[in-house]
């Protein structure tokens, strides 16, 4: 029986050109996390494998950085990055847990002040 729950950063509104961190956290289960996939729509952005570490998809290498933790940092945001992102936790013995985050990327004058963040 799958008892775990995924907590996410929550939906985010950010500025074009800025950076944001997408994070998920799996709780309420003792299952072992074997791999975390990050996807947008049907595109694979990155994989964090418990044994093999991180793999960033070649098409995102310039703008996606691994971490912090099992999270993902998106840099040099464009309006085209607007959409839904999925963290997919592969666990044993529970199976797969999925978290969802919607990211809205806006022109600089529109995005909220709280989302004008740059990764230090």
């Amino acid at each position: 029986m799958m008892t775990g729950t995924i907590e996410t950063t929550g939906n985010i509104s950010a500025e074009k050109g800025g950076s944001i961190i997408l994070q998920c956290h799996l709780s309420s289960t003792t299952a072992q996390v074997t791999q975390v996939n990050w996807e947008q729509q049907d595109q694979l952005l990155a994989i964090c494998n418990a044994d093999l570490g991180w793999h960033i998809s070649p098409s995102f290498k310039d703008r996606v950085a691994p971490g912090p933790g099992l999270g993902l940092t998106l840099q040099s945001l464009t309006v085209n990055d607007t959409g839904e992102y999925f963290c997919i936790y592969h666990t044993y013995p529970d199976g797969t847990y999925t978290g969802r985050i919607f990211l809205e990327v806006l022109e600089s004058s529109v995005a909220e002040h709280g989302a004008r963040f740059q990764i230090p």
């Epitope: 996410t8 985010i12 607007t82 709280g114």
Partner: antibody, heavy 119, light 112 residues
Framework: EVQLQQSGPELVKPGASMKISCKAS????????MNWVKQSHGDNLEWIGL????????SYNLKFKGKATLTVDKSSSTAYMELLSLTSEDSAVYYC????????????WGQGTSVTVSS | DVVVTQTPLSLPVSFGDQVSISCRSS???????????LSWYLHKPGQSPQLLIY???NRFSGVPDRFSGSGSGTDFTLKISTIKPEDLGMYYC?????????FGGGTKLEIK
């Protein structure tokens, strides 16, 4: 003036599919998300999903995945929702609603399209 | 999904009354950057829902200042300071922080 004009009421047979349109005017269509909301009997409001006209990206309430398909035609500033394999449970009023930038709210709503599924 | 609970279900009022509607969520609506996406809507019979308040406390364009929103975390309140005839209808809160967005069950504001 922002306006969302939806297609008219529909009476459809069980098992059929249908498409509702939502024509946007008075703003830059590709700059805002378009949401779809179901109002069923008992005044219940449910978010069906949204589409990003700029890139065609979608987000669905999993309850409606496989039931609703969202598309846009940028050239006519029109959003569409196709409802598949209709049953009596799908009888409702459906609204399109523009996403309010940066606050994940819905600022302008269409007038609603009433869908009745009956044989 | 985040469960949003509105109270009361029904609110009988007299014109001129001040009322409060409560909205509670099953988890915090603050995202990791401290932004909270909670909005309020009025749905009058035969009309489309209309946005009243967004981002907890911001009044939408054209909304009278007798409407105000407050709260944080999981507890939110809509206050109407002086009820007028045009305020009657169903009020809904909506959380937009977590996917999928979810509405409260609604509060019917009606005449006593």
């Amino acid at each position: 003036e922002v306006q969302l004009q939806q297609s008219g009421p529909e009476l459809v047979k069980p098992g059929a599919s249908m498409k509702i349109s939502c024509k946007a005017s008075g703003y830059s269509f590709t700059g805002y998300t378009m949401n779809w909301v179901k109002q069923s009997h008992g005044d219940n409001l449910e978010w069906i999903g949204l589409i990003v006209p700029y890139n065609g990206g979608t987000s669905y309430n999993l309850k409606f995945k496989g039931k609703a398909t969202l598309t846009v035609d940028k050239s006519s500033s029109t959003a569409y929702m196709e409802l598949l394999s209709l049953t009596s449970e799908d009888s409702a009023v459906y609204y399109c609603a523009r996403g309010l930038q940066r606050f994940y709210a819905m600022d302008y709503w269409g007038q609603g399209t009433s869908v009745t599924v009956s044989s | 999904d985040v469960v949003v609970t509105q109270t009361p279900l029904s609110l009988p009022v007299s014109f001129g009354d001040q009322v409060s509607i409560s909205c509670r969520s099953s988890q915090s609506l603050a995202n990791s950057y401290g932004n909270t996406y909670l909005s309020w809507y009025l749905h009058k019979p035969g009309q489309s829902p209309q946005l009243l308040i967004y981002g907890i406390s911001n009044r939408f364009s054209g909304v009278p200042d007798r409407f105000s929103g407050s709260g944080s975390g999981t507890d939110f309140t809509l206050k109407i300071s002086t009820i007028k005839p045009e305020d009657l209808g169903m009020y809904y809160c909506l959380q937009g922080t977590h996917q999928p967005p979810t509405f409260g069950g609604g509060t019917k504001l009606e005449i006593k």
